[in-house]
């Protein structure tokens, strides 16, 4: 059965997945897909890496961890109820049928209704893209609103704070961890 993770509408969801590269930077291709892991590849791919970096992506999906050390956990920015469902993390180890597959269930809950807070920094308005500890370059025009010139390393901690802290507990006990080499 899938490991279950929860987030509220409007939050960033976090789906953990890890492997241990044979050597730092000696990466194994990874894909993330919406839907349970099929026999090969990922269905409905939302993000993919090759041996070097992220080479396929969709706008709200990011790898916030140090994927060159095997942290390929997926962050989904500003989730909606439609993001609920099974996600596949597939570690594409070379060789026939060597892939490691992890199915993770994401449950999105409606946002809690709270009194209007005192004015806070609107993170997604100020920085419409998700933020990561490694640069992913300039804003794309599919993003609404203007994006100031930002330093991603300085504000990655803000992105981390947006994670539902409950999802961060006992990540490495989730079973979504393998060792390669």
């Amino acid at each position: 059965s899938e490991v279950e993770y929860r987030a509220e509408v409007g939050q960033n969801a976090y789906l953990p997945c890890f492997y241990t590269p044979a050597a730092p930077g000696n990466l194994v291709p990874v894909c993330w897909g919406k839907g349970a892991c099929p026999v090969f590849e990922c269905g409905n791919v939302v993000l993919r890496t090759d041996e070097r970096d992220v080479n396929y992506w969709t706008s709200r999906y990011w790898l916030n961890g140090d994927f060159r050390k095997g942290d390929v956990s997926l962050t989904i920015e500003n989730v909606t109820l439609a993001d609920s469902g099974i996600y596949c993390c597939r570690i594409q180890i070379p060789g026939i049928m060597n892939d490691e597959k992890f199915n993770l269930k994401l449950v999105i809950k409606p946002a809690k209704v709270t009194p209007a807070p005192t004015r806070q920094r609107d993170f997604t308005a100020a920085f419409p893209r998700m933020l990561t500890t490694r640069g992913h370059g300039p804003a794309e025009t599919q993003t609404l609103g203007s994006l100031p010139d930002i330093n991603l390393t300085q504000i990655s901690t803000l992105a981390n704070e947006l994670r539902d802290s409950r999802l961060a507990n006992d990540l490495r006990d989730s079973g979504a961890t393998i060792r390669i080499g």
């Epitope: 490694r134 640069g135 992913h136 794309e140």
Partner: antibody, heavy 118, light 106 residues
Framework: QVQLQESGPGLVKPSQTLSLTCTVS?????????WNWIRQPPGKGLEWMGY???????SYNPSLKSRITISRDTSKNQFSLKLSSVTAADTAVYYC???????????WGQGTTVTVSS | DIQMTQSPSSLSASVGDRVTITCKAS??????VAWYQQKPGKAPKSLIY???YRYSGVPSRFSGSGSGTDFTLTISSLQPEDFATYYC????????FGGGTKVEIK
């Protein structure tokens, strides 16, 4: 093996629009990566101009944003650069390059020289 | 925008020398730096990405290091084919390049 090849006129008149095309072979531009334009004025350094991603979204250097358009023709596996209102300062070698989401550039075209002159 | 200041702008060295090129970012760019080699009339070639990872096929004499604002490209033992111009590039924000370092034969 991925290959990129720039093409277009080598001479453009001031105030006109520079148009270049990059033809990609060995990889579908819709399958992944960001497809970039980078230029290098004679004897000078490199300047990133912008990209179009595998999904069709674009991103431009703020200094060129009012003049630049990058588009693609997926049926021909090509992407194109248009730069309007050119001046002599736009004289350069123009490269197309394949980049990652983090835009660093593993594959480059051979480059094409464009001179802006009347 | 983020400025990348490369030094020296040129250097003379002999085959077998150890060569070090530095690049300083105007603000913190993490490890989001790449290095390229360019020979006259040719397109740049990728050497290093993410500050320290060697691109496939690049000889082991090339190495990169640094994080934050200070980065270094080292050629441990210069070979005849290494005489070229080298550029650093940051990609923490929209990409910007250093001004280049020309490595010439002494």
């Amino acid at each position: 093996q991925v290959q990129l090849q720039e093409s277009g006129p080598g001479l453009v008149k001031p105030s006109q629009t520079l148009s270049l095309t990059c033809t990609v072979s060995g990889y579908s531009i819709t399958s992944g990566f960001a497809w970039n334009w980078i230029r290098q004025p004679p004897g000078k350094g490199l300047e990133w101009m912008g990209y179009i991603s595998h999904s069709g979204s674009t991103s431009y250097n703020p200094s060129l944003k009012s003049r630049i358009t990058i588009s693609r023709d997926t049926s021909k596996n090509q992407f194109s650069l248009k730069l309007s209102s050119v001046t002599a300062a736009d004289t350069a070698v123009y490269y197309c390059a394949r980049g990652y989401r983090s835009p660093w550039f593993a594959y480059w075209g051979q480059g094409t020289t464009v001179t802006v002159s009347s | 925008d983020i400025q990348m200041t490369q030094s020296p702008s040129s250097l003379s060295a002999s085959v077998g020398d150890r060569v070090t090129i530095t690049c300083k970012a105007s603000q913190n760019v993490g490890a989001n730096v790449a290095w390229y080699q360019q020979k006259p009339g040719k397109a740049p070639k990728s050497l290093i990405y993410s500050a320290s990872y060697r691109y496939s096929g690049v000889p082991s004499r090339f190495s990169g290091s640094g994080s934050g604002t200070d980065f270094t490209l080292t050629i441990s033992s210069l070979q005849p084919e290494d005489f070229a111009t080298y550029y650093c590039q940051q990609y923490n924000s929209y990409p910007t390049f250093g001004g280049g370092t020309k490595v010439e034969i002494k």
